[in-house]
């Protein structure tokens, strides 16, 4: 669809004659008629194949005709088609003398004809005009005429409809030759695509409209390119959606037992060795100096009273030493140099000669102790604590520092571990020697019976066109991971191709 | 050939939401090349346009019902759906599921076969 | 809103020719496209992307769209022809239809 435009610039008719050569009265009253068809190689009478269109009387004799497009569209002429444009024209152009107002054919003479063109040629679709002028004996007539395509036609023959639109069937403008040119962001034959953010991944990712992206399920992030793990995966990662693999140091379905307590805690103090031996469980070796579970607590050289025979002990950065009361000598005041003459024995305690007098021993009364009953009786030294529980003087009396897992004075009672209820989900507590086992109703497992025990819900191979399963554990149900070229929650949908143009 | 199957009650009273399914059958609801629409006609009437939606989720609704319409779409089932809430006596009417061609400008070259709704208590 | 306008009722004779027309301001830039609804059926499309026919449309169907007017026209037409007409187009995301017009072939 197009118009052949016709512009009329200038009639000469400068004796105002008529074909005939018979003189206008009073002069030529001049207007046109235009017939344009198909070519021909010798411009023949016949149907106006290609259309008609006539003028008002545009002057007299000789004149200039204006450019009245924005006017009421008189010139240029407009000579609208409704085909294929064939690049090939004839046209003929009559100027007749009107004598009245009644400008229809069948109301003039035939005589009345001032002068006739018919040309013919080739003429390709665009904005150029081509200029012609042509003379006859006593006129002249210049022009010049183009065609070009309707609104919304193109390509070199107008017969290409495209019309720009921007809504969801299609974000585009036309181009010259009636190609669609996509809006920016938008992509595909009919431009109804977005282009999605910038590394979206092709899988993992979509959009609905440009410089989205949109994840499908399992995977998260602004690319989607990070997968969803296990719900409850507390110290794990995954490659792949619902995945939970452990770091390091850590177990368990959801990684939230800890292997390694040693290196995540710390618990050692002052420079212990710390060693793992099991889960949330753990050994300190303490340095020279140190005692406690945790090595927390500093050890005196001189607790263990090291000293005799009433010698008092003193701390040094590299030990101990022992200050010896009179009649003493030697590293811990263990050498005599007194009798039972001297009056040794403190306390109440009894001497007895050894070695025809060169010696002697003290017994002591109860509560006392040492070689001259010098010291109170050390209530640790009969190792009363038992389980391996840490004895510790209080002045009068003891206390027993019990391990994890003993109470009692002397730590002799096993703490119950069922105690505290640790079997989840109705599970039975048995104790055990050391520690404690869980036994789980169906449909439970683990060491707590903390893991519901699910159905692989990716047995049946749910999942089309080589789509990889990923079972959720936490909901019994599955997920496909599509390949490219498919959708839907089986990936058994291929995605289809838009089909070809129609044009 | 692509088929469409519009199902659903038939009576539903004034106030409630009105809930039709469209079951595609002979091809797959997410082709790049198609939107899925609604469009309803009531007794004696002209149609009207709902909406539609596409298979990533995408919809697109008529202004003066959006406020009480959801379109949505199971790629799974190779269905979408309609619902239209706070329904009255004016939603009475034939409601067709169709769809709608990238390639034919957004013409709609395959309906379903409708099915009366009627809101009345 | 974007409203189009078809006239209520076209009457032709058999053999002739029926011309509907569907106005909406500047509908020439759009895609216009008819359907064609006889009582108790779905609607048909006839003409898609104002001139266009699908595969199985008669050739008697033709349309056309420019300025603020889509035309269907039929020619020859026959007594199967009779039923409502309705044009519709896409105004920015919102589909359109006319009110369409009855066809009676007297």
């Known amino acids: 669809s197009g118009v052949f435009q016709l512009q009329l610039q200038e009639f000469i008719n400068e004796r105002g004659v008529l074909a005939s050569g018979r003189p206008c009265e009073p002069g030529c009253r001049t207007f046109f008629r235009v017939c344009l068809k198909h070519f021909q190689a010798v411009v023949s009478p016949g149907p106006c194949t290609f259309g008609t269109v006539s003028t008002p009387v545009l002057g007299t004799n000789s004149f200039a005709v204006r450019d009245d497009s924005s006017g009421g569209g008189r010139n240029p002429l407009q000579l609208p088609f409704n085909f294929t444009w064939p690049g090939t024209f004839s046209l003929i152009i009559e100027a007749w003398h009107a004598p009245g107002d009644d400008l229809r054919p069948e109301a003039l003479p035939p005589d009345a004809l001032i002068s006739k063109i018919a040309i013919q040629g080739s003429l390709a679709v665009g904005q150029n005009w081509l200029l012609d002028e042509q003379t006859s004996t006593l006129t002249r007539l210049r022009y010049s005429y183009r065609v070009i395509c309707s609104d919304n036609y193109y390509g070199d023959n107008c017969s290409r409809l495209c019309k720009k639109r921007n809504d969801h069937f299609g974000h585009y403008v036309c181009q010259p030759d009636g190609n669609l040119s996509c809006l920016p962001g938008w992509t595909g034959e009919y431009c109804q695509q977005p282009i999605c953010l910038s590394g979206c991944h092709e899988q993992n990712g979509y959009c609905s409209k440009p410089a989205e992206c949109l994840c499908r399920p399992g995977w998260q992030g602004r690319l989607c390119n990070e997968c969803i793990p296990h719900n409850g995966c507390r110290h794990g990662t995954c490659s792949t959606p619902w995945q939970c693999t452990c770091d390091e140091g850590w177990g368990g379905l959801f990684c939230d037992q800890d292997l390694n307590y040693c290196t995540h805690h710390s618990p050692c103090k002052n420079g212990a060795t710390c060693s793992n031996s099991g889960q949330r469980s753990y050994t300190c070796t303490c340095r020279p100096g140190y005692t406690g579970v945790d090595c927390e607590l500093e050890l005196s050289e001189c607790d263990s009273n090291p000293c005799r025979n009433g010698g008092s002990c003193k701390d040094q950065e590299d030990g101990y030493h022992c200050l010896c009361p009179p009649g003493y000598y030697g590293l811990h005041c263990e050498h005599s140099t007194l009798s039972c003459a001297d009056s040794p024995c403190f306390n109440g305690g009894s001497c007895r000669e050894r070695n025809q007098g060169a010696n002697y021993a003290c017994e002591c009364p109860p509560n006392f102790t040492g070689s001259n009953c010098e010291k109170k009786v050390d209530r640790c030294t009969s190792n009363p604590c038992a389980n391996g529980g840490q004895c510790l003087n209080r002045g009068p009396s003891r206390m027993c520092r019990c391990r994890p897992g003993f109470t009692g004075t002397y730590c002799e009672l096993h703490v119950s571990d069922c105690a505290r209820n640790p079997c989840a989900h109705g599970g039975t507590c048995h104790d055990l020697e050391n520690g404690l086992m869980c036994t789980c109703p169906a449909g439970f497992s683990g060491r707590r019976c903390e893991v519901r025990t699910s159905i692989d819900a990716c047995a049946s191979s749910p999942c089309f066109n080589r789509a990889t399963c990923y079972t959720d554990l936490s909901t019994d149900t599955f997920v496909c991971n599509c390949p490219y070229g498919f959708v839907g929650s089986r990936c058994e949908f291929p995605v289809g191709l838009p089909p070809s143009f129609p044009w | 050939e692509v088929q469409l199957q519009e199902s659903g009650p038939g009576l539903v009273k004034p106030s409630e939401t009105l809930s039709l399914t469209c079951t595609v059958s002979?091809?797959?609801?997410?082709?790049?090349?198609?939107?899925w629409g609604w469009i309803r006609q009531p007794p004696g009437k002209g149609l009207e346009w709902i909406g539609d939606?596409?298979?990533?989720?995408?919809?697109y609704y008529n202004p003066s019902l959006k406020s009480r319409v959801t379109i949505s779409v199971d790629t799974s089932k190779n269905q979408f759906s309609l619902k239209l809430s706070s329904v009255t006596a004016a939603d009475t009417a034939v409601y067709y599921c169709a769809r709608f061609d990238v390639s034919l400008g957004g013409g709609s070259d395959t309906w379903g076969q409708g099915t009366l709704v009627t809101v009345s208590s | 809103s974007y409203e189009l306008t078809q006239p209520p009722s076209v009457s032709v004779s058999p053999g002739q020719t029926a011309s509907i027309t569907c106005s909406g301001q500047?509908?020439?830039?759009?895609?216009a496209s008819w359907y064609q609804q006889k009582p108790g059926q779905s609607p048909v499309l006839v003409i898609y992307e104002d001139s266009k026919r699908p595969s199985g449309i008669p050739e008697r169907f033709s349309g056309s769209n420019s300025g603020d007017t889509a035309t269907l026209t039929i020619s020859g037409t026959q007594p199967m022809d009779e039923a409502d007409y309705y044009c519709?187009?896409?105004?920015?995301?919102?589909?359109?239809f006319g009110y369409g017009t009855k066809v009676t072939v007297l």
């Open positions: 500047r509908l020439g830039d759009k895609y």
């Open positions: 002979g091809g797959s609801i997410s082709s790049s090349s198609y939107y």
């Open positions: 519709q187009a896409w105004d920015r995301d919102t589909g359109v």
């Open positions: 939606i596409y298979y990533t989720g995408s919809t």
